[in-house]
Interface confidence: medium
């Protein structure tokens, strides 16, 4: 039988390349049984998370896991940064890995490349 | 149901470069994360990378110089390219699917084999 | 990289006997609060076929003769009662940490 222990499924070191004022969902990838934990996303600042209190957030229910997502709409600048999501579950906090955001800024690009492109050549992001 | 399809040359010339394409119907590239592993002929697997359902990318290290993953959203494939290839580069190549939940491969292509030779 | 060692390389079991194979990592597989090692069965001219993931979960249409434990470093698929369709190679899997890595593989025959 399997555990019902809350589980994030954020790969360690995961990274996004995104372009500032595009839409983007962050997602965190929740395992939980019977109840829903109560998820937060926060930003990295330093060696604290701050919380994302005001930012829109939804679920997205599948088979097997749920998505607890963290609405860009559109992505900004200083969108760049590293993310973690935590639930709260039976008194104990749960946190993911983080996973940081790349954000480009389409006025500093010459030519403004696609997504697939950017995602198989991150070097277009440091022009 | 997820089913995969690898395409490509069953042979290439040394210092070349290998193209493969993975198709994918039964679900989105732009959910969950795709896979490229290879089995050695004396049965050893190596796993080689992937693109994620966001488009990121990520390369086994002993491969970086060398390796490519890109996709196509609309077709709904994704594409392993090679550089430089070697005879240690031979091998059966499969592309497959790891879950969110635990990163497992669920499903996989049948897979290919490339001889590389001269 | 973590290294997963297997065990045995070669195992010959009867028919309806029990086979125990045996994976070892390098490094402890639970960064994620869970133990994410995974078993796979490879037949002759097939793909690997997963057969138990998360150390303990048997996949779907997979048959309850196959099973998983262990945590930490050391791990355990056993097939018990072996069939003569259970001859294949068995692969221990670890996606706890980048790269991905395999074990060697165990082949299991039948005595």
């Known amino acids: 039988k399997e555990s019902c222990d809350v589980q994030l499924y954020i790969k360690r070191q995961s990274e996004h390349s995104i372009l500032a004022g595009d839409p983007f969902e962050l997602e965190c990838p929740v395992k939980y049984c019977a109840n829903r934990p109560h998820v937060t996303w926060c930003k990295l600042n330093g060696t604290t998370c701050v919380k994302l209190e005001d930012r829109q957030t939804s679920w997205k229910e599948e088979k097997n896991i749920s998505f607890f997502i963290l609405h860009f709409e559109p992505v900004l600048p200083n969108d760049n940064g590293s993310y973690r999501c935590s639930a709260n579950f039976q008194s104990n906090l749960i946190e993911s890995h983080s996973t940081t955001l790349y954000v480009t800024d389409v006025k500093s690009a010459s030519e403004r490349p696609s997504k697939d492109e950017m995602a198989s050549r991150p070097w277009l992001l440091y022009r | 149901e997820v089913q995969l399809q690898e395409s490509g040359p069953s042979l290439v010339k040394p210092s070349q470069t290998l193209s493969l394409t993975c198709s994918v119907t039964?679900?989105?590239?732009?959910?969950?994360?795709w896979n490229w592993i290879r089995k050695f002929p004396g049965n050893k697997l190596e796993y080689m990378g992937y693109?994620?359902?966001?488009?990121?990318?990520y390369f086994n290290p002993s491969l970086k110089s060398r390796i490519s993953i890109t996709r196509n959203t609309s077709k709904n494939q994704y594409y392993l390219q090679l550089n430089s290839v070697t005879t240690e580069d031979t091998a059966t190549y499969y592309c497959?699917?790891?879950?969110?939940?635990?990163?497992?491969?669920?499903?996989w292509g049948h897979g290919t084999t490339l001889t590389v030779s001269s | 990289d973590i290294v997963l060692t297997q065990s045995p390389a070669s195992l010959a079991v009867s028919l309806g006997q029990r086979a125990t194979i045996s994976c070892r990592a390098s490094?402890?597989?639970?960064?994620?609060?869970?133990?994410?090692m995974h078993w796979y069965q490879q037949k002759a001219g097939q793909p690997p076929k997963l057969l138990i993931y998360?150390?303990?979960n048997l996949e779907s249409g997979i048959p309850a003769r196959f099973s998983g434990s262990g945590s930490r470093t050391d791990f355990t698929l056993t097939i018990n009662p072996v069939e003569a369709d259970d001859v294949a190679t068995y692969y221990c899997q670890q996606t706890d940490e980048d790269p991905y890595t395999f074990g060697g593989g165990t082949k299991l025959e039948i005595k």
């Open positions: 039964g679900d989105s590239i732009t959910s969950a994360y």
């Open positions: 693109i994620s359902y966001s488009g990121s990318t």
């Open positions: 490094e402890t597989i639970d960064s994620y609060g869970d133990s994410l």
């Open positions: 497959a699917r790891s879950h969110y939940y635990g990163y497992y491969f669920d499903y």
């Open positions: 998360r150390a303990s």
